[in-house]
């Protein structure tokens, strides 16, 4: 049986960014249409996971599995579930949570980000990265790269393979 | 407010291990007490994903993340709200779906654990890395090794961090 | 077909080293799918296994507990040898030491002619 | 560490006779995963090293006369010589592989009586 995944083009290019991996964030922007100025955005911060390095990209990889593995993630499946008491009321969709992060982690400022991180893991080594990680996308990111990013996200969200 | 994780130190040393992260892997073991044969296993699977490069801990990163916020581990969130409608009977257990991913990759020939693989995540390219990483630890892991990395997983799964 | 080739002294002096070293031919000491061994027998303990080598990416030991805190096996992949050292012997170690290659790390199907090694007090 | 026990110690028996050796290890050596026993038996002649005869409980190694065989599951082991011959005196030893630290049996001598 193949098992219906939460929004599988997301993780793909989450983990494509977080990884440093260029020819792997190419070939699951092409799935989702990504315009030129969209691939840029996204290789922006491409590039401040690949500069602070491995522990980054663990740290970051951690923060991902443990919101998505989180009871708010959870929580939101349980909803449906209470509402009707059915299990195929579970969509694909992206966890709003998830959604939260990703947004703040792109508009927000430093200090919000971080905070929601710590909502879900609150050891200081994961914070100082994410503070950096955040920083660094606002030091190489022009307001257009960001709004080029959440345009992304909305493809990404509403795509077929979401 | 914290939220509750499904067993955060299983995805620490997870992602320790996956990244190829030693000292990482060296505090979340010294956490639950592991035995000097117990780190010894797990040293011998994280020399797989260092040896197999960035591209195997970006895929299994993936799988995991995928298999942890999968409609079969989020099923059983929903189960236990189903049975009395309340959210707070959802738990830190980790999901069965992850552990018996793990116990495969430990314990199951290359087919069963592939099989599993690619019931979550069927890209060609992540069930080729899937079987790779299970063949390496196969070729370095004994059978005592494999029964030390098991007796550490129970550790994790019953420890209070989980 | 396999054959392994034992040398070293047959005679060591209390609290110094023992130092074996075994030559393989017929098969490669990096091989990925077979462990070296080294073994010995007395009348007191038996045959009683010290520990191995074996490749897989890197090199990996294993080692008896008996003697953990004294032993080294190490392989040299230029000589497609590998040697024991087994350090502050006492007249206890006295004993015939075999050299054997295990088929990945199970039976040993392949063993040295063995070696005589006395400790001297 | 697993504790092979090995009887008798030593058995004389005439040519032609069928000589069985047992072993018994301290705990199971079936890997319920691939439902092996991880056990061989050696022969040892004097002046020589161990010859490998068994291996996985019951599989013969090449060009070991197949009148030898190697029986039993979990902890209890047997060694068989069905016609006993003059080549087969020897000390015989069991040995275990599952556990990392590899443990033999005290051996059993096997004479022409």
């Known amino acids: 049986v193949k098992m219906a995944e939460t929004c599988p083009i997301f993780y793909d290019v989450f983990f494509a960014v977080a990884n440093g991996n260029e020819l792997l964030l190419d070939l699951s922007l092409t799935k989702v249409n990504a315009t030129e100025p969209e691939r840029t955005a996204m290789k922006k911060i491409q590039d401040c996971y690949v500069e602070n390095g491995l522990i980054s990209r663990v740290l970051d990889g951690l923060v991902m599995t443990t919101i998505s593995s989180s009871k708010d993630c959870m929580g939101e499946a349980v909803q449906n579930t209470v509402e009707d008491l059915k299990l195929n009321t579970l969509g694909r969709e992206i966890c709003p949570a998830v959604k939260r992060g990703v947004d703040l982690f792109l508009t927000g400022t430093p200090d919000e980000y971080v905070e929601q991180v710590a909502q879900y893991k609150a050891l200081p080594v994961v914070l100082e990265n994410a503070r950096i990680l955040k920083n660094c996308v606002d030091a190489k990111m022009t307001e257009e790269d960001k709004e080029n990013a959440l345009s992304l996200l909305d493809k990404i969200y509403t795509s077929p393979l979401c | 407010v914290k939220m509750a994780e499904t067993c955060p130190i299983f995805y620490d040393v997870f992602f320790a291990v996956a990244n190829g992260n030693e000292l990482l892997l060296d505090l979340s073991l010294t956490k639950v007490n592991a035995t000097e044969p117990e780190r010894t296993a797990m040293k011998k699977i994280q020399d797989c994903y260092v040896e197999n490069g960035l591209i195997s801990r970006v895929l299994d990163g993936l799988v995991m993340t995928t298999i942890s916020s999968s409609k079969d581990c989020m099923g059983e969130a929903v189960q236990n709200t189903v049975e009395d409608l309340k959210l707070n009977t959802l738990g830190r257990e980790i999901c069965p779906a992850v552990k018996r991913g793990v116990d495969l990759f430990l314990t199951g020939t290359p087919d069963e654990y592939v099989e599993q693989v690619a019931q979550y995540k069927a890209l060609p390219v992540v069930l080729e890395n899937a079987r790779i990483l299970k063949n390496c630890v196969d070729a370095k892991m004994t059978e005592e090794d494999k029964e030390n990395a098991l007796s550490l997983l129970d550790k994790i799964y019953t420890s209070p961090l989980c | 077909q396999v054959q392994l080739q034992q040398s070293g002294p047959g005679l060591v002096k209390s609290s110094q080293t023992l130092s074996l070293t075994c030559a393989i031919s017929g098969d490669s000491v990096s091989s990925n799918s077979v462990a070296w061994n080294w073994i010995r027998q007395s009348p007191s303990r038996g045959l009683e296994w010290l520990g191995r080598?074996?490749?897989?990416?890197?090199?990996?030991?294993d080692y008896a507990v008996s003697v953990k805190s004294r032993i080294n096996i190490n392989p040299d992949t230029s000589k497609n040898h590998f040697s024991l050292q087994l350090n502050s012997v006492t007249p206890e170690d006295t004993a015939v030491y075999f050299c054997?290659?295990?088929?990945?790390?199970?039976?040993?199907?392949?063993w040295g002619q063995g070696t005589l090694v006395t400790v001297s007090s | 560490d697993i504790v092979m026990t090995q009887s008798p110690d030593s058995l004389a028996m005439s040519l032609g006779e069928r000589a069985t050796i047992n072993c018994k290890s301290s705990?199971?050596?079936?890997?319920?995963?691939?439902?092996?026993?991880?056990l061989g038996w050696y022969q040892q002649k004097p002046g020589q090293p161990p010859k490998l005869l068994i291996y996985?409980?019951?599989t013969r190694e090449s060009g070991v006369p197949d009148r030898i065989s190697g029986s039993g599951s979990g902890t209890d082991f047997t060694l068989t010589i069905s016609s006993l011959q003059a080549e087969d005196v020897a000390v015989y030893y069991c040995?275990?592989?599952?556990?990392?630290?590899?443990?033999f049996g005290g051996g059993t001598k096997v004479e022409i009586k």
């Open positions: 040995q275990q592989y599952l556990r990392n630290t590899l443990t």
């Open positions: 054997a290659r295990a088929w990945n790390w199970y039976y040993l199907d392949y």
């Open positions: 705990q199971s050596v079936l890997y319920s995963s691939n439902n092996k026993n991880y």
């Open positions: 996985w409980a019951s």
């Open positions: 080598t074996y490749y897989r990416s890197k090199w990996y030991n």
